[in-house]
Amino acid sequence: AYYQQLNTELKENLKDTMTKRYHQPGHEAVTSAVDQLQQEFHCCGSNNSQDWRDSEWIRSQEAGGRVVPDSCCKTVVALCGQRDHASNIYKVEGGCITKLETFIQEHLR
């Protein structure tokens, strides 16, 4: 029951956090946490990389033409997020929710 509740909250909150708070002034801790999550779990977006299309930051000029954050890249270099290609984006690897679910299941046993 606890796992199910945690799982539901993760699903509801992660995409909301990514779309509304990522790279917004005053939310540097959130940005850093999302970057770390994507890099360490080899994932991109909440469900998949296309989730980033809804991000206020990605949609603005501040993103500099990126379609995903640079932290979605397998090899991170500045502006690597401009090309949403599976060769350097955690695209086929799935979203971060799936990766987090697996991690939580393994550590709650």
Epitope: Q24, P25, E56, Q61, G65, V77
Partner: antibody
Framework: EVKLVESGGGLVQPGGSLKLSCAAS????????MSWVRQTPEKRLEWVAY????????YYPDTVKGRFTISRDNARNTLYLQMNSLKSEDTAMYYC???????????WGQGTLVTVSA | DIVLSQSPASLALSLGQRATISCRAS??????????MHWYQQKPGQPPKLLIY???NVESGVPARFSGSGSGTDFSLNIHPVEEDDLAIYFC?????????FGGGTKLEIK
């Protein structure tokens, strides 16, 4: 050509209110983050308000938090700054500004002067 | 808040000389390989003008005489050769962490 035109400045007494406007043209306003930056008579620059492209996120430094409110009307291509409980230290030239890409402010208006004095 | 310390506060140079303005941040302004430090020029009666963004990228329309360098906490703006038109105040600004802050400015005068 990108154009930002501020208006609404003037002389106001301490404790008073003022609403600044910034009319934008020459770019897709609704996809641009916007900021207000002020410059004191001593030429010091201070970033005083930020609003995300869709208006969902705002940010204020502690010096103005609770007194200033930034808003935008994407249909009218206009940015606003509502300033309440004004203090003498709020006396400055107020500029609206936005980055071209990234976070360096490439586009600035000519500014509107706000003087808070009894 | 990240404090930006600019030096010198003022600089008087002859035409053709090199101007070097320094900006030191109280914390790193690096983000995923990008230095979120920018440089502006402000002439009397005008708003600031972006010269350099992200430490070393020259903004469109800015003469090649202007260059920026640095990373982490230490940055510099170079102008070479200095021309009459460069008489202005120069500011650095960081956008790594809110509130975004500006340096105190460096006034460049021509001898």
């Amino acid at each position: 050509e990108v154009k930002l035109v501020e208006s609404g400045g003037g002389l106001v007494q301490p404790g008073g209110s003022l609403k600044l406007s910034c009319a934008a043209s020459g770019f897709t306003f609704s996809t641009y983050t916007m900021s207000w930056v002020r410059q004191t008579p001593e030429k010091r620059l201070e970033w005083v308000a930020y609003i995300s492209s869709g208006g969902g996120t705002t940010y204020y430094p502690d010096t103005v938090k609770g007194r200033f409110t930034i808003s935008r009307d994407n249909a009218r291509n206009t940015l606003y700054l509502q300033m309440n409980s004004l203090k003498s230290e709020d006396t400055a030239m107020y500029y609206c500004a936005t980055p071209r890409i990234g976070t360096g402010f490439a586009y600035w208006g000519q500014g509107t002067l706000v003087t808070v004095s009894a | 808040d990240i404090v930006l310390s600019q030096s010198p506060a003022s600089l008087a140079l002859s035409l053709g000389q090199r101007a070097t303005i320094s900006c030191r941040a109280s914390a790193s302004v690096e983000y995923y390989g990008t230095s979120l430090m920018h440089w502006y020029q402000q002439k009397p009666g005008q708003p600031p003008k972006l010269l350099i963004y992200e430490a070393s990228n020259v903004e469109s329309g800015v003469p090649a005489r202007f260059s920026g360098s640095g990373s982490g906490t230490d940055f510099s703006l170079n102008i070479h050769p200095v021309e009459e038109d460069d008489l202005a105040i120069y500011f650095c600004q960081q956008s790594r962490k809110a509130p975004y802050t500006f340096g105190g400015g460096t006034k460049l005068e021509i001898k």
